[in-house]
Interface confidence: low
Amino acid sequence: AKTTPPSVYPLAPGSAAQTNSMVTLGCLVKGYFPEPVTVTWNSGSLSSGVHTFPAVLQSDLYTLSSSVTVPSSPRPSETVTCNVAHPASSTKVDKKIVPRDCGCKPCICTVPEVSSVFIFPPKPKDVLTITLTPKVTCVVVDISKDDPEVQFSWFVDDVEVHTAQTQPREEQFNSTFRSVSELPIMHQDWLNGKEFKCRVNSAAFPAPIEKTISKTKGRPKAPQVYTIPPPKEQMAKDKVSLTCMITDFFPEDITVEWQWNGQPAENYKNTQPIMNTNGSYFVYSKLNVQKSNWEAGNTFTCSVLHEGLHNHHTEKSLSHSPGLQLDETCAEAQDGELDGLWTTITIFISLFLLSVCYSAAVTLFKVKWIFSSVVELKQTLVPEYKNMIGQAP
């Protein structure tokens, strides 16, 4: 077995272990190799009442424990610290042990907090935009000031990868720390449903904490996108709302944004994805604009990114048509009229092009015919000219 540093865990009892005004505190030294480790208490100044038990070998790693018995009341003015040294790995760990006071009945016994680990998926926009880098993020919160650094390990489909960027731990105003590790991933790895695992290890944890994440399983379904102009009743106000309805998509990872004359718009809000009865999702997005900007005929575009879409992207535009104020009830008729208008325009253009081609063909034919006639005429006239010249006086 290779050299392995120990993990050190504090052992603090509740009221049950407090007898005869004494309290026994412990230190568990786990998972080291090779022997030996040395355990002292308060750097050797606490020596009476110390018991260090023989090491036990399990799965090629050693574990031992040490305990010290100190007066529980009055409390010792100095804190009790267990000092562990493992020369083979050049490791030294000092672990402060705080007895938990659960003596008084009305009090609530607050257990020392365990750090929480969360794993977050990449942003949908990053996954669906080839120029952006999607990242899976692992966050450890509630790290105690006395805890050693946490170590992050990352796995993609259980294969360890070493491309993560881990930031130095950051102190919070509540005296705890947080640590963040980001794993840049391949767009296709996420879309293909690979599993990303973050393993967090620390001497403060009884065992490594693992969190896994992957894309929601299921067949992607492209959203339908509809834009809705401001309702007639809202036109009396200074600001109006443009709505984008995005329906029937799966999975729920989606990005909805607005552009105004091609520039990103800011003043919009999206609902969270809401599940339909059939398991697909829908979202509404509302863009608030000045009525004057709407009435000026500016173009507003609802832009949607979703993995089910062709090229992962679609957009629908909306602009005010001056003098054409239609009720919502006319929307379907309006769509029909527009469809009819497009048909008319298409037929007109087709006929126009056909007539141009026909005219061009006829003209070419006529020009060719006239040209050939002229050439023939010229050939018949030339000899007569010659004869006339020859007969001149």
Epitope: I119, F120, P121, K123, K135, T137, V141, T271, Q272
Partner: nanobody, 122 residues
Framework: QVQLVESGGGLVQAGGSVRLSCAAS????????MTWVRQAPGKGPEWVSA????????RYAESVKGRFTISRDNAKNMLYLQMNSLKPEDTALYYC???????????????RGQGTLVTVSS
């Protein structure tokens, strides 16, 4: 620096009500989903409720649904949790948390306050 400060906890009778507040500073409060998390004595953290940026979409843990209401006031940078019909099992330290931008807000927080203790006596 991000700061979240909870208040409003205390001792309350079973069946009673309490309103928790969370004052946020050091970041653009209106741009972040927010969450409440609680930790009962001797247990791990438990997600309670979350709210979107505009305050018009909320989610709740099954254990509190119908009894707790989360809300926010973006103008005041405040998050609230109205807790009604309290039960002894609601006894816990309640934290408000900021949900990171890269998260679906059911999945955790990146910053939290120090917590306010709610004790429900039977």
């Amino acid at each position: 620096q991000v700061q979240l400060v909870e208040s409003g906890g205390g001792l309350v009778q079973a069946g009673g009500s309490v309103r928790l507040s969370c004052a946020a500073s050091g970041f653009t409060f209106s741009s972040y989903y927010m969450t409440w998390v609680r930790q009962a004595p001797g247990k791990g953290p438990e997600w309670v409720s979350a709210i979107n940026t505009g305050g018009d979409a909320t989610r709740y843990a099954e254990s509190v649904k119908g009894r707790f209401t989360i809300s926010r006031d973006n103008a005041k940078n405040m998050l609230y949790l109205q807790m009604n019909s309290l039960k002894p099992e609601d006894t816990a330290l309640y934290y408000c948390g900021r949900v990171p931008g890269y998260s679906d807000y059911r999945q955790g927080y990146d910053y939290r306050g120090q917590g306010t203790l709610v004790t429900v006596s039977s």
